[in-house]
C-alpha cells in the first residue's frame, strides 16, 4: 500500500477514502513533494505581510512585508517596523543615534563612526546620524604640493537581511 | 550562491606579519561589510574588527588597535586582514564573515577559516 | 567593556531539552544573536535578533532575551546537534563594537 502512495506527485495526496488513489490538492493548499498523506494549507498574507508569491498546488504562498516594515526569520515570518536613517529601533520603538554613531538603513542599530586616525588618515568629511565620517589621506600627505585625494564612493546600497 | 574563500593556512616567526585575504562571490561585494573574527586552540570566538568595502572605512577592537589592518581590493571582490608584531598568542584560525546588510544582525555568511601558527 | 557569560557546559539525553544560557547587563535591551560551532568548520548562525532562524535551521531551535538573560533552546536534541555554542551582541561604543561569550559545549549523553 505504502508503494501506491509513493507514486502520488507532488500537488496530489494520497486519500486514504478513495483505495489510495492520487486526488488533486483543494483549493488553498499545496504539497511540495510527492507521497503526501495530506496537503498543507497555504500561508496567507494578510495585515502587515503582502503576498510576493501566490500558492499553488505544489508549492506555498511567499510573503513580504508592506511598506514601512521589513522581513525577520526564515521565510519573512515576522514584519519589524522601519525606522529612519538616523535611527535605531529599540524594545521601546525608534530613536535618534547618539551622538558618534550613524545609521544609513532603515533597520538595525547605530553603528559608531569610523576612527581615521587607526588607518593613519584624517576626517575628510565629518560624520552624522545617517552618514560615517569620510576619511581622507593621512596628515602628512596635506603638506603643500601633495595631490588631493579623490573621496571614496558614496554610502552603500541597503543589503538584505540573513533569511 | 555567496560564498567567502580564504587564503591558505601561514607558519610565521614571532614579530613578523601575516596578511589573510577573503574572496568574495556570489553578491555585491561592495554592499555588505565584512568582519573578522579568530579562535585560538581551545579558547572561543573573538571579534577583531569590520571593513567597508565601499569605502574602505574601518572600525577595530580595542585588543588590536594598533597591529590590525583591514583593506580591501573592489576590482577582485577580496578583502584582507594584515596582523603585525605576531605573538605566540596570535596563533588562531581567522574568519571572514559578511555582515547581513544592517548593523544590529548577526553575521550570516562565513569563511572557511585560516590557521596562521606563530612560532619560533 | 560589554561581558557576556555563559556556562562552560551543557549535558544532555538525545530527545530531551537542552537550554543555553547567556548573561549580560540589561542584554533584554540588546539583539543577541547565537552561532553554532563545531571542530574544524566556521560558525554557523542559527539563531539572530533574539528570536530568529535563518533559512534552513530547523524549528526546534529556538531562542528569547529578556532581563539579564538571553537563551537558546534546542528541543528533541539529536546527537548532530554537539559543538559549541556562542552567544553575540553589537554595542554602538567605538572601543568594542563585536563582543562574543565564552562558549558553551553542549554534550550530548549516551
Known amino acids: 500500500l505504502q508503494d501506491l502512495c509513493s507514486n502520488c506527485p507532488a500537488g496530489t495526496f494520497c486519500d486514504n477514502n478513495r483505495s489510495q488513489i492520487c486526488s488533486p490538492c483543494p483549493p488553498n493548499s499545496f504539497s511540495s513533494a510527492g507521497g503526501q498523506r495530506t496537503c498543507d494549507i497555504c500561508r496567507q498574507c494578510k495585515g502587515v505581510f503582502k503576498t510576493r508569491k501566490e500558492c499553488s498546488s505544489t508549492s506555498n504562498a511567499e510573503c513580504d512585508c508592506i511598506s514601512g516594515y521589513h522581513c525577520l526569520g526564515a521565510e519573512c515570518s515576522m514584519c519589524e517596523q522601519d525606522c529612519k536613517q538616523g535611527q535605531e529601533l529599540t524594545k521601546k520603538g525608534c530613536k535618534d543615534c547618539c551622538f558618534g554613531t550613524f545609521n544609513d538603513q532603515k533597520r538595525g542599530i547605530c553603528r559608531p563612526w569610523t576612527n581615521c586616525s587607526l588607518d593613519g588618515k584624517s576626517v575628510l568629511v565629518n560624520g552624522t546620524k545617517e552618514r560615517d565620517v569620510v576619511c581622507g589621506p593621512s596628515p602628512a600627505d596635506l603638506s603643500p604640493g601633495a595631490s588631493s585625494a579623490t573621496p571614496p564612493a558614496p554610502a552603500r546600497e541597503p543589503g538584505h537581511s540573513p533569511q | 550562491q555567496v560564498q567567502l574563500v580564504q587564503s591558505g593556512a601561514e607558519v610565521k616567526k614571532p614579530g613578523a606579519s601575516v596578511k589573510v585575504s577573503c574572496k568574495a562571490s556570489?553578491?555585491?561585494?561592495?554592499?555588505?561589510?565584512m568582519h573578522w573574527v579568530r579562535q585560538a586552540p581551545g579558547q572561543g570566538l573573538e571579534w577583531m574588527g569590520w571593513?567597508?568595502?565601499?569605502?574602505?572605512?574601518?572600525n577595530y577592537a580595542q585588543k588590536f588597535q594598533g597591529r590590525v589592518t583591514m583593506t580591501r581590493d573592489t576590482s577582485i571582490s577580496t578583502a584582507y586582514m594584515e596582523l603585525s608584531r605576531l605573538r605566540s598568542d596570535d596563533t588562531a584560525v581567522y574568519y571572514c564573515?559578511?555582515?547581513?546588510?544592517?548593523?544590529?544582525?548577526?553575521?550570516?555568511?562565513w569563511g572557511q577559516g585560516t590557521l596562521v601558527t606563530v612560532s619560533s | 567593556s560589554y561581558v557576556l557569560t555563559q556556562p562552560p557546559s551543557v549535558s544532555v539525553a538525545p530527545g530531551e531539552t537542552a537550554r543555553i544560557t547567556c548573561g549580560g547587563d540589561?542584554?533584554?535591551?540588546?539583539?543577541v544573536h547565537w552561532y553554532q560551532k563545531k571542530p574544524d568548520q566556521a560558525p554557523v548562525l542559527v539563531v539572530y535578533?533574539?528570536?530568529y532562524r535563518p533559512s534552513g535551521i530547523p524549528e526546534r531551535i529556538s531562542g528569547s532575551n529578556s532581563g539579564n538573560t538571553a537563551t537558546l533552546t534546542l528541543s528533541r536534541v539529536e546527537a548532530g546537534d554537539e559543538a559549541d555554542y556562542y552567544c553575540?551582541?553589537?554595542?554602538?561604543?567605538?572601543?568594542?563594537?563585536?563582543?562574543f561569550g565564552g562558549g558553551t559545549q553542549l554534550i550530548i549523553l549516551g
Open positions: 564573515a559578511r555582515e547581513p546588510g544592517y548593523y544590529g544582525s548577526g553575521l550570516d555568511y
Open positions: 556570489g553578491y555585491s561585494f561592495t554592499g555588505y561589510y
Open positions: 571593513i567597508n568595502p565601499n569605502s574602505g572605512g574601518t
Open positions: 540589561d542584554i533584554g535591551d540588546k539583539r
Open positions: 535578533e533574539d528570536r
Open positions: 553575540q551582541v553589537w554595542n554602538s561604543s567605538s572601543d568594542h563594537p563585536g563582543v
